[in-house]
């Protein structure tokens, strides 16, 4: 008989009369003893079933006994037997000699024995008898009350066995044997695979088996699972993870597909893909940056690429006798980063801005020139009368990896020491709600005709986050379009053709409420 | 071949007595019991009884007690019916039939050929 | 005891047809019930035992069913052959026959 799988998983089937297709054929003793029955089910298939009836006779002794059967990988078997059997008080006029069990036995031989029988070699399982239990099973028009009974055996040390059924008096049908014995069947837990294992027969003790991670999965922890008596897998320890580019799915590891990436193992899912990078295959552990877009070193795969930033807008500066301070606004596009920081070159050109030369070590920046993150810096130690040319760069985190050239915006500054001095004292000569009318000294020195003056301000609640500026040839101006009742700061720079004075000290004045009169005042000067 | 073998016809008269047998072939005389059907002309079956061929112990219908006995000789695997004080009444035709038990249900599944008793004076 | 009542006491069929024939029982006989096949001048056939198991040799065009007090014998297409007198008999409490059933030709 050769072993299949039945549609239970953990139970390896030796013998299933109920699957076999010719006659059964084994050997009856004596000849009017058991009778070779084939029944049909309701599906018109063959049900090989073996019958006895011998209740008139006392001291009946009908032996059935199977082929030799192959234990297979089994140590301890199992024996299910669906029967039915008569009740002798339906038969009154037999009860003395009418039975109501039979016998189960075994031997265990490594080969057939062919015809030869000797019941009185054979070991006893057990007395079957029919309990209160029943199935029912259709044969043809006739319904029928099924006694199952499981017996175990073993251990099996040979390589297979016989089983043998007494009657000694019965009037019974054996309607089904199955043999089997139970496995652990192959499974996969936590990504890993657990191969068909065979319990111990001490029904006691469990095997401990060691699993192997699925493909494209890893151990995390050495995954076990024990292998009970009735094989049933218990106690699951450890686990495997699915491995970078892979994501778990209904117990196994499938690539993530284009578009999607995973960068680490684990029972994450895949991410797809962060903006600015792709991946056109499966698999993939890290997205690739599109052209134009890089990733630090420092950046963690989940993070957009991101690309240099363009140059610093508005650059300006002010300069006196012993300090030069440069200003710039950031670059409209940061390339996506927070770690922005500045570079300020210095050039000294000629009349011909193409015959330029590095402005050496004589030069002091404060703080530094480079890796700068404010966005300013004071120039000390300059020459007088030379032309600086000053390239301020942005950079931040991938500017390194860039091959373009890193963007700039220059500002040439001539260090004349006639640019004029600063205005005097400022003061308020009118307010009203929405305007303020301003006027100042003009500056103790000025080295030739004041083109105009720079009159920059803003709100003292918001102090340098938006500025405004305004000019005038005058040393007054009103600047309108201001908010009721709100503080404003103000300071202003002259301007001559030898270039800007620094920028005053910063006056602070107030626009009218709704109620105020126009009323002027001296400036407050902000220190 | 199983077969049941029954004597000829007998004619009788009334207050008489007749012994029919039924010999056994082609079995095990003692694993079946033997079962006993009357048949008048022209009516139907009436089941008469049985015995027990291994104990000879015997079972009769309601009808059927008193003037018949059934009775065995395992040694030639022979059942015997006898009727004594006939009466006209009991003409008819007298089938031995072997009763086959199985785990499904009972059934008479091997019948002699029948004897016609007919009792008239 | 135990009464059996079959009906109807004649069918007529034609061969071919299909021919139902009806036991009834006095009280719940379980299915302990058979039936047998007589032609004039035979001896009767066993047919069906335990309510629905055909005897060795009998032909599946008969078929039986029923349990309890109600069972019926079905021919799916008569043959020339089953023309003949059919009888129940139940061994559920003593044995008894029904008065039978003719199927003659139509």
């Known amino acids: 008989w050769t072993g299949d799988c039945s549609h239970v998983s953990n139970q390896v089937v030796l013998l299933d009369t109920t699957t076999v297709m010719g006659e059964l054929g084994w050997k009856t003793y004596p000849l009017n003893g058991w009778d070779a029955i084939t029944e049909m089910d309701e599906h018109n298939r063959p049900i090989h079933t073996y019958q006895v009836c011998n209740v008139m006779e006392p001291n009946q002794n009908n032996w059935l006994r199977t082929n030799w059967i192959s234990r297979d990988a089994a140590q301890k078997i199992y024996v299910e037997m669906k029967f039915t059997l008569r009740d002798c008080n339906s038969i009154p006029w037999v009860l003395g000699t009418c039975k109501e069990t039979f016998n189960l036995y075994y031997i265990e031989s490594d080969e057939s024995h062919g015809t030869k029988f000797k019941p009185s070699q054979y070991i006893k399982i057990d007395t079957i008898a029919a309990d209160e239990s029943f199935t029912q099973m259709d044969l043809g028009d006739r319904i029928l009350k099924l006694n199952t009974e499981i017996r175990e055996v073993g251990p099996i040390e040979r390589k297979g066995f016989y089983l043998a059924f007494q009657d000694i008096g019965a009037c019974i049908a054996l309607v089904s044997v199955r043999v089997f014995y139970k496995k652990c069947p192959f499974t996969v837990r936590n990504l890993a695979m657990f191969p068909d294992t065979i319990p111990r027969v001490d029904s006691s003790s469990l095997v401990e088996v060691r699993g192997s991670c699925v493909k494209s999965a890893e151990e995390r922890d050495t995954p076990k699972l024990y292998c009970g008596a009735d094989g049933d897998w218990l106690v699951p320890l450890g686990r495997c993870i699915c491995s970078t580019g892979y994501e778990e799915i209904e117990g196994s590891c499938h690539a993530c597909r284009p578009g999607f990436y995973k960068a680490f193992a684990g029972n994450t899912k895949c991410s797809k893909c962060p903006p600015h990078s792709s991946t056109y295959v499966e698999a993939t552990s890290v997205c690739h940056c599109e052209k134009g877009y890089f990733r630090a070193e420092k950046d963690p795969p989940s993070m957009a690429c991101t690309r240099p930033p363009s140059a610093p807008r508005n650059v300006a500066f002010n300069i006196n006798e012993t300090a030069l301070i440069l200003e710039w606004s950031p670059p409209s596009d940061t390339g996506g980063r927070k770690d922005l920081t500045y570079s300020v070159i210095c050039k000294k050109c000629g009349l011909d801005t193409t015959q330029c030369e590095d402005c050496g070590g004589g030069l002091r920046f404060i703080p530094r020139h480079t890796g700068l993150i404010n966005n300013s810096v004071v120039v000390l130690d300059f020459v007088s009368h030379v032309n600086y040319t000053f390239e301020i760069e942005a950079m931040n985190g991938v500017s390194e990896l860039s091959i373009s050239p890193k963007p700039f915006t220059a500002i040439t500054v001539t260090t004349d020491h006639d640019a004029p001095s600063l205005i005097g004292m400022m003061r308020k000569d009118w307010a009203s709600q929405n305007s303020l009318a301003l006027s100042w000294q003009a500056p103790a020195f000025s080295n030739g005709a004041i083109l105009d003056y720079e009159i920059k301000y803003y709100e003292k609640e918001h102090e340098q986050l938006t500025y405004s500026s305004t000019r005038s040839k005058a040393p007054s101006v009103i600047v309108t379009g201001l908010k009721p009742a709100t503080t404003y700061i103000f300071h202003i720079r002259v301007r001559t053709a030898t270039g800007y004075s620094g920028y005053s000290q910063k006056f602070e004045f107030e626009t009218g409420d709704e109620t105020s009169d126009m009323a002027a005042e001296q400036g407050q000067i902000l220190v | 071949q199983v077969q049941l073998l029954q004597s000829g016809a007998e004619v009788k008269k009334p207050g008489a007595s007749v012994k029919v047998p039924c010999k056994a072939s082609?079995?095990?005389?003692?694993?079946?019991?033997m079962s006993w059907v009357r048949q008048a002309p022209g009516q139907g079956l009436e089941w008469m009884g049985w015995?027990?061929?291994?104990?000879?112990?015997?079972t009769y219908a309601q009808g059927f007690t008193g003037r018949f006995v059934f009775s065995l000789d395992t040694s030639v695997s022979t059942a015997y019916l006898q009727i004594s004080s006939l009466k006209a009444e009991d003409t008819a035709v007298y089938y031995c039939a072997r009763v086959r038990l199985t785990v499904y249900g009972d059934g008479m599944d091997v019948w002699g050929q029948g004897t016609l008793v007919t009792v008239s004076s | 005891e135990i009464v059996l009542t079959q009906s109807p006491a004649t069918l007529s069929v034609s061969p071919g047809e299909r021919a139902t024939l009806s036991c009834r029982a006095s009280q719940s006989v379980s299915s302990n019930l058979a039936w047998y096949q007589q032609k004039p001048g035979q001896a009767p056939r066993l047919l069906i035992y335990?309510?629905?198991t055909r005897a060795t040799g009998i032909p599946d065009r008969f078929s039986a069913s029923g349990s309890g007090t109600d069972f019926t014998l079905t021919i799916s297409r008569v043959e020339p052959e089953d023309f003949a007198v059919y009888y129940c008999q139940q061994y559920g409490s003593s044995w008894t026959f029904g008065q039978g059933t003719k199927v003659e030709i139509k």
């Open positions: 335990g309510a629905s």
């Open positions: 082609g079995y095990t005389f003692t694993s079946y019991a």
């Open positions: 015995i027990n061929t291994n104990t000879g112990n015997p």
